[in-house]
Interface confidence: medium
């Protein structure tokens, strides 16, 4: 005789938040602590995510949902998830291999992340400088020789952030 | 499990030495860069020194510059901070990390932290 498995596995019942047990005939657990199933019919539980070291919790583990962290102040965070924490720079820095470093000459930075850029060449867009750059800052154009006819005085402003999903402060 | 088990942390007179250790597990250790951080009492995390893969890089912070040194045993998958001439500005939790100011192309993010060893430098 040939048991017919059941048309439905009896472990798609187990909502979230508990395991299909095999040890027990594959009757619903609770996910012991420290562990969390969010979805249902999971045959395991996963281990909570520990945010330590640089890592805060901003958000605790449930039996339903894995922790979530974020990072301690001086650092942000990077990947999917806050996988990792870098460390912040003052504006008009850089992070490099020694730790943050000034911007050279010609760039700037004006976050805390990021790399420093080249200043905008005022002079590409026919333009002059109207305000000088900094490490932090970029330049600010002004109008052209030809724009300085009375009357005309219009001013470019600084140039955005160049990297994406940064806006500059 | 990925982990990371600081140790070697005590109480040393000024002038003193301590070697911290970082023994690491559940990874490739010999792939990564590796840095070690610090958290004096109030204050914020500090970068102390980094080390690339082989050890052929090394990086300081420069308040422990000369005083400090980073090395790594990647047949033990250790993480090594010998330092000498310990001043009571030293006095921190020391954390090593994986990961480093420059280990990737694309960040220099740390993913992995220990839970910390502390050193209090006091006569």
């Known amino acids: 005789f040939e048991r017919t498995r059941s048309l439905q596995d009896p472990c798609s019942n187990c909502p979230a938040g508990t395991f299909c047990d095999n040890n027990r005939n594959q009757i619903c657990s609770p996910c012991p602590p420290n562990s969390f199933s969010s979805a249902g019919g999971q045959r395991t539980c996963d281990i909570c995510r520990q945010c330590k070291g640089v890592f805060r919790t901003r958000k605790e583990c449930s039996s339903t949902s894995n922790a979530e962290c974020d990072c301690t102040p001086g650092f942000h965070c990077l990947g999917a998830g806050c996988s990792m924490c870098e460390q912040d720079c003052k504006q008009g820095q850089e992070l490099t291999k020694k730790g943050c470093k000034d911007c050279c000459f010609g760039t700037f930075n004006d976050q805390k992340r990021g790399i420093c850029r080249p200043w905008t060449n005022c002079s590409l867009d026919g333009k002059s400088v109207l305000v000088n750059g900094t490490k932090e800052r970029d330049v600010v154009c002004g109008p052209s020789p030809a724009d300085l006819s009375p009357g005309a005085s219009s001013v470019t402003p600084p140039a955005p952030a160049r990297e994406p999903g940064h806006s500059p402060q | 499990e990925v982990q990371l088990v600081e140790s070697g942390g005590g109480l040393v007179q000024p002038g003193g030495s301590l070697r911290l250790s970082c023994a690491a597990s559940?990874?490739?250790?010999?792939?990564?860069?590796m840095t070690w951080f610090r958290q004096a009492p109030g204050g914020g995390l500090e970068w102390v020194a980094n080390?690339?893969?082989?050890?052929?890089?090394?990086y300081y912070v420069d308040s422990v510059e000369g005083r400090f040194t980073v090395s790594r045993d990647n047949a033990k998958n250790s993480l090594y901070l010998q330092m000498n001439s310990l001043r009571a500005e030293d006095t921190a939790v020391y954390y090593c990390?994986?990961?480093?100011?420059?280990?990737?192309?694309?960040?220099?993010?740390?993913?992995?932290w220990g839970q910390g060893t502390t050193v209090t430098v006091s006569s």
């Open positions: 080390i690339n893969q082989d050890g052929s890089e090394k």
């Open positions: 990390a994986r990961g480093g100011l420059g280990y990737g192309d694309s960040h220099y993010g740390m993913d992995v």
């Open positions: 559940g990874f490739t250790f010999s792939n990564y860069w």
